[in-house]
């Protein structure tokens, strides 16, 4: 059997949701001895990067300028050490946003509710789209989908203080082309006294693993050629 190297990890720097005409940055994190990295888009070669001495990092960044719907889709990467190629990375779904129109997000019964109440978000977009997406800030990998011709419902069920936070919605023209984001709606959930004081508001930081962590090699890392990583995939 043909020998291959462990698969690299592909990530989007900052976010996988890139406004049109802005630059996307994808990171391919492989092996310290890699002499070449290839980025593939929808199965075809898209770009090549070759680290050179004295650069010694465990991966490379691919910059994709001028994001548009033709560059949105599924990316993967591979790397080479000597003559030996790695397995292909998991697929990364890169989405272009700020296409066409802006939806309106509302919440029923209102933005301030009590723990245990049933809450429903409504996302409305008058232009032709059938899929709507609801994202909570700081949790952009947890995308909820709903369908409707002009408006979609996102029933949350009985909420807890964990549902607190800022929400936005998008209309989706296809899996990889999304509308402008709606204005945010901040959901405030109050609980009983002891719960309220203990439950912190959800952070609105970007997803922690949406950052390119290309590092220098150390002796220890040489033995652990790749980080143990359980890949999550957005649109599967």
């Amino acid at each position: 059997p043909k020998q291959t190297l462990p698969k690299p990890i592909i990530r989007a720097e900052s976010t996988y949701m890139v406004p049109k005409e802005k630059q996307a940055t994808l990171c391919c994190q492989g092996s310290y001895g890699a002499v070449e990295y290839q980025l593939h888009f929808e199965g075809s070669l898209f770009a090549v990067e070759r680290p050179k001495p004295p650069e010694r990092i465990n991966g490379v960044k691919f910059h994709i300028p001028d994001m548009n719907s033709r560059k949105a889709g599924r990316y993967s990467c591979i790397y080479r050490v000597g003559e030996l190629w790695s397995e292909r990375s998991d697929l990364l779904d890169l989405v272009v946003t700020e296409m066409y129109d802006t939806p309106t997000l509302s919440v029923h019964p209102g933005p301030e509710v009590t723990s245990g109440e049933k809450v429903t978000f409504y996302c409305r977009l008058d232009t032709a789209t059938s899929m709507f997406l609801l994202l909570k800030e700081g949790r952009s990998r947890d995308v909820q989908r709903s369908y409707g011709k002009v408006q979609a419902e996102f029933p949350m069920g009985p909420v807890t203080t964990a549902h607190r936070g800022s929400y936005r919605c998008f209309g989706s023209y296809n899996n990889y082309a999304w509308s402008f984001p709606s204005e945010p709606v901040k959901l405030l959930v109050t609980g009983d006294i002891e719960n309220t004081s203990l439950a912190p508001t959800d952070p609105t930081f970007p997803d922690s693993w949406d950052t390119c962590l290309l590092t220098r090699e150390t002796g220890l890392q040489k033995d652990l050629a790749l980080w143990d990583h359980t890949a999550q995939n957005l649109l599967r």
């Epitope: 310290y32 050179k52 001495p53 004295p54 650069e55 010694r56 990092i57 290309l214 220098r216 090699e217 150390t218 002796g219 040489k222």
Partner: antibody, heavy 117, light 107 residues
Amino acid sequence: DVQLQESGPGLVKTSQSLSLTCSVTGYSITSDDYWNWIRQFPGNKLEWVGYISYDGSNNYNPSLKNRISITRDTSKNQFFLKLNSVTTEDTATYYCARLGYPAMDSWGQGTSVTVSS
Amino acid sequence: DIKMTQSPSSMYASLGERVTITCKASQDINSYLSWFQQKPGKSPKTLIYRANRLVDGVPSRFSGSGSGQDYSLTISSLEFEDLGIYYCLQYDEFPWTFGGGTKLEIK
């Protein structure tokens, strides 16, 4: 913190060999990066001489032809420069330096070598 | 060998001034360029690598730009501690080659 220290004779006669040692503390030269010799001529011009990498492979400046050898002693965490058949043109301050971007690099303080006839 | 032509060879600038130093390669070096600072009596220190990536710990007033054959180092607001000699280094091809240096002095 990694520190590099050059040592060797300050005066060498023409046609003889120049031998310099770089002693590295606080970091293993087999862990990573590129362990370089760089020289600075009077007048401040810098020239890359060559390196030995973490895995023991070399790259040399072809201008030094077959006169150069960079080796290491991993047990002492040292690497060495040997330059044969020196001339007065080899008079310079010689630096050993660790380069490995994007890391902070580390340089020795330099050792002055004069080649005299 | 790739020849790196740096300009100016020396310059005077005032504190707070924006300073730009340029480096031109004799051929395309694919952004494999770093910038070094050497303060009087000290060893060189890397500021920038891959043309525009700042080394950890280097003040953000330093920035690099350029592509192909033409590159520049900019100090957005000159401070007294920035005086010294600045060098570019190409590492696209062996042998790595340095520019001739730019001596930066305070007016």
